[in-house]
């Protein structure tokens, strides 16, 4: 949700941050393999090119950029966004009739655009919905036992534990780990009330749970979300993960063959969203002013008055639904089995104009423009372009993750980049981006080529933009591509410093969006131009536009972080020598590959393919091979989560300095060894064949 993102400000419209979507999971019934799916075509068969292809093709970048721009100029984005916000498709909860009807519309549009092939994946997944009979409820229990009803909320939090709890109520600001640590009172055995924003609902609940809270209430405060409607309902989900939480780490194919299982990311406490009006009613019974540093409106109070309790009843129920992911492909002319994936969430709990309408509209228009460029304008992409419309994004990128889980063993050898279109337009002031470092150079080139829709200046305004880029967050559909599958991914947005206030609410309508962004068509055009240029650069050039050298600086900064603890490391009788060596090997491998590329005969597609194959493996090899994708799905040592990550290793060392008795030395020794070998593995993969690897290790 919008309120889960926190972005840096970048003056002049160029910069970083993260705009994105949810997570994912998948149940598939089509047994075809990905290559089989892509094999068929509904357009005339294209001749297989010979060993060499004309070098002249590299000169077409300016032509293609201009052609894309011309098509963008004549495209009506707002008309499509408005269409997707009509009652025929609104609301479109995942797996519902309206979601399916929109899926069919997308599928028919892809066919009309004459894409090479259009297909669908069907999955059966479990989501959580409100009970049709029993109501969720928040009540104040007076000392004499009288009940004072606060609210039966219209919104809810999917994957809450369905249960009833009573206890004291305390405020925990945004519910970040830092917020909980800084509280002057204990939350142990109490319910906590937190405001939306800064981090995902799932992280708020996990943090509350780790501090032994018994339940969580989430509301939108007036300062962060200056919405007039105090009774506005809010929706979100609390799964600390992506995909179907009841088939963790594996796809939801025919679910009967799998043992019952559930994600460790599911909360063990109830969580419920409440309106601001309900929160203010609770504050009326609470005491203690909230700290000024919270920058919160004055109605905020800290603790429920003595002799009173709050009762939270959550009656959400599990529901098995059928979801459809819709795909269309434009086949590459040289390497059709390598593809860039462009995707957008289709479903929404409410009207979902900014949440899924804009992304779906961009997806449709990009598919139309690129198909047009291929069929009419002579664009011959070397690699394939897959357009994907995901369902159940609102429940944690379920559709997207299910697809990834279904093809885990092979997808990283085929899909080399994911471009996320979700929430690409939330404002106008800033251009923010979150991505794998492999894509930073491509992003920079694109920012130097695309003008801000309002200021008319190029998006590239800050040469230091890359240092301010934020990690992809769990609620972004690009996250599982990067952290689970090891596929470089990018998510971007035109947005404000403040959160878009209507995401996850019934006010996320076209009407509100166009009111807040009168230049909506121009901004959507710019978002499409950014994504379009990414696609051209990634599919047109002979060399894959993935800058493997960018991880050198990431590894270097990790080494710098570790160097602060060299005394601690020496005290344990350990050395960083092997880690330095692995980092050095990675550096040398990147230098060698760059030299290989410069010396290569660019027109020899076999040589180029060998080089590109090495580049494609880089991200995947940053997935720790030492943890199970089922237990720790987000295996990426930089961007994932869990004890195998480089940040966890550093946190563990910090703990040694802060509280040596809590420090786990055995865990650290493992972390250091496995991180070293993972980095060494990436260096080896980049070096190519085994006889090229200098193994003096």
């Amino acid at each position: 949700h919008h309120h889960h993102h926190h972005h840096h400000h970048h003056s002049g419209g160029g910069g970083s941050g993260g705009g994105g979507s949810g997570g994912g999971g998948s149940k598939g019934v089509e047994p075809k393999t990905e290559s089989e799916r892509l094999a068929g075509t509904e357009s005339p068969v294209r001749e297989e090119p010979g060993e060499d292809f004309p070098a002249a093709r590299r000169l077409y970048w300016d032509d293609l950029k201009r052609k894309l721009s011309e098509k963008l100029d004549s495209t009506d984005f707002t008309g499509t966004i408005k269409l997707l916000n009509e009652n025929s498709y609104v609301p479109r909860e995942a797996g519902s009739q309206k979601d399916e009807n929109l899926a069919l519309y997308v599928e028919n549009q892809f066919r009309e655009f004459k894409l090479s092939k259009v297909w669908r994946d069907q999955h059966f997944v479990k989501i959580q919905v409100k009970d049709s009979i029993g109501q969720n409820m928040v009540t104040i229990v007076q000392s004499n036992g009288n009940l004072d009803p606060v609210e039966s909320p219209e919104g809810y939090v999917a994957f809450s534990k369905p249960t009833e709890v009573s206890g004291k109520l305390v405020h925990a600001n945004f519910g970040t780990k830092k917020d909980f640590e800084e509280l002057s009172y204990s939350v142990n055995g109490s319910l906590v009330i937190v405001r939306a924003g800064e981090i995902t609902f799932a992280e708020k609940v996990a943090n509350a749970q780790s501090f032994n809270a018994i339940g969580v209430l989430i509301y939108m405060d007036k300062n962060k979300f200056p919405v007039v409607e105090a009774d506005l309902a809010l929706f979100g989900h609390a799964h600390l993960g992506t995909g179907d939480p009841y088939t963790p780490g594996f796809p939801s194919f025919n679910h009967t063959q799998f043992p019952p299982s559930q994600s460790s990311g599911l909360p063990n406490i109830p969580v419920q969203t409440i309106s601001r009006a309900a929160a203010e009613k609770l504050f009326g019974k609470m005491e203690g002013s909230c700290p000024a540093r919270w920058n919160i409106d004055s109605s905020c109070k800290l603790e429920l008055s003595q002799n009173q309790n709050v009762k939270l009843i959550v009656k959400n129920v599990l529901k098995e639904i059928k979801i459809l992911n819709i795909f269309g492909v434009i086949k590459g002319f040289v390497e059709p089995d390598h593809y860039v994936v462009v995707g957008a969430q289709r479903d929404a709990w409410g009207p979902g104009a900014a949440k899924s309408g804009v992304g779906t509209a961009l997806l449709l228009k990009l598919a139309q423009m690129f198909s047009d460029m291929v069929l009419k304008d002579g664009f011959q992409p070397s690699r394939s372009i897959i357009f994907a419309s995901w369902s159940a994004g609102d429940f944690g990128s379920v559709g997207a993750t299910e697809w990834l889980e279904g093809y885990l063993s092979s997808l990283h050898l085929k899909a080399f980049t994911y471009i996320n279109l979700d929430k690409a337009v939330l404002g106008t002031s800033n251009f923010k981006v979150s991505a794998s470092p492999l894509l930073y150079t491509l992003i920079e080139k694109t920012m130097q080529n695309v003008k801000h829709p309002v200021t008319g200046q190029f998006l590239y305004q800050d040469s230091n933009w890359a240092s301010k880029v934020e990690k992809l967050t769990l609620d972004n559909a690009a996250f599982p591509f990067l952290a689970y599958s090891g596929i470089p991914a990018v998510s971007f947005c035109f947005c404000e410093d403040t959160d878009y206030p209507y995401l996850g609410t019934t006010m996320d309508t076209y009407k509100e969006l166009i009111e807040r962004i009168p230049e909506l068509n121009k901004v959507a055009r710019a978002a499409a131009e950014v994504a379009g240029q990414f696609v051209i650069k990634l599919t047109h050039d002979v060399e894959l536009n993935l800058d493997y050298e960018m991880y050198n600086s990431k590894l270097l900064s990790f080494m710098k972080d570790l160097n602060q603890f060299k005394t601690d490391i020496r005290d344990m009788g350990l050395s960083l020598q092997w880690l330095y060596s692995a980092r050095g090997d990675y550096f040398r491998a990147t230098s060698r590959l760059t030299t290989d590329f410069h010396n290569a005969e660019k027109t020899n597609r076999f040589v180029m393919r060998e080089i590109n194959d090495r580049i494609m493996k880089v991200e995947y090899h940053f997935l720790s091979p030492y943890v199970s994708p089922r237990e720790s799905p987000f295996r990426h040592i930089f961007w994932g989560s869990g004890s195998h990550t480089l940040s966890a290793l550093v946190e563990n060392l910090k703990l040694r300095q802060k509280n040596i008795t809590a420090f786990n030395e055995t865990l650290f020794r493992n972390q250091l060894a496995l991180a070293t070998w993972t980095i060494q593995g990436v260096a080896n993969a980049l070096s190519g064949d085994i006889w090229n690897i200098d193994n003096e290790f």
Partner: antibody
Framework: EVQLQQFGVELVKPGASVKISCKAS????????MDWVKQSHGKSLEWIGD????????SYNEKFKGKATLTVDKSSSTAYMELRSLTSEDTAVYYC????????????????WGQGTSVTVSS | DIVMSQSPSSLAVSVGEKITMSCKSS????????????LAWYQQKPGQSPELLIY???TRESGVPDRFTGSGSGTDFTLTISNVRAEDLAVYYC?????????FGGGTKLEIK
């Protein structure tokens, strides 16, 4: 008891506009969509469009886009349909009807109907 | 748009008789996920507004006498009135609510001999 109250007759000149009202009672107005249906004399029924009073979103039959505009006033639980650039073809009885639950992702029939407003376009 | 065709356009029956009228849609109204047919029948008595009789092709609206029965699936639907009474004099419309725009049949006018 669910009731949709419409006013009987509107006599308007060609080229003019008319705004028909439909006041709902007996249920929570924002909980259900409101549909509008046209019936020309002796003819069948034609669906014009619907409005979701909770989200303030609409859908129109392509045939009536540019002709009809649907709005609501939540405070008075009233739905409105404005018809513009009227011609003799627009002479008909116009009904409002309660549609499906506004928060539903599924389609539903129209379960309660107003008594209709007769619009006559004549110079 | 889905085209709804009703037949006959009119029929005259005597009180106490059983009659059936047909409604055909140009595409299936069956939603496979919930196995429901998105078809409704409305009754419009002279000078009155339409009233919902049947929805989901066969479910009677509350208060509707069990003389009225809806049946059919996919593209072919039937409304049966057994033991016709004088107050059943009306035009009966079928309507699909499976896909926007919602569309109605031309109606079947029931006259009493």
């Amino acid at each position: 008891e669910v009731q949709l109250q419409q006013f009987g007759v509107e006599l308007v000149k060609p080229g003019a506009s008319v705004k028909i009202s439909c006041k709902a009672s007996g249920y929570i107005f924002t909980d259900y969509n409101m549909d509008w249906v046209k019936q020309s004399h002796g003819k069948s029924l034609e669906w014009i469009g619907d409005i979701n009073p909770d989200y303030d979103t609409t859908s129109y039959n392509e045939k009536f886009k540019g002709k009809a505009t649907l709005t609501v006033d939540k405070s008075s639980s009233t739905a409105y349909m404005e018809l513009r650039s009227l011609t003799s073809e627009d002479t008909a009885v116009y009904y409002c009807a309660r549609g499906g639950y506004s928060g539903s992702s599924y389609y539903h029939p129209m379960d309660y109907w107003g008594q209709g407003t007769s619009v006559t376009v004549s110079s | 748009d889905i085209v709804m065709s009703q037949s006959p356009s009119s029929l005259a029956v005597s009180v106490g008789e059983k009659i059936t009228m047909s409604c055909k849609s140009s595409q299936s109204l069956l939603y496979s996920t919930n196995q429901k047919n998105y078809l409704a029948w409305y009754q419009q008595k002279p000078g009155q507004s339409p009233e919902l009789l049947i929805y989901w092709a066969s479910t009677r609206e509350s208060g509707v006498p069990d003389r009225f029965t809806g049946s059919g699936s996919g593209t072919d639907f039937t409304l049966t009135i057994s033991n016709v009474r004088a107050e059943d004099l009306a035009v009966y419309y079928c309507q699909q609510y499976f896909i926007y725009p919602r569309t109605f049949g031309g109606g079947t006018k029931l006259e009493i001999k």
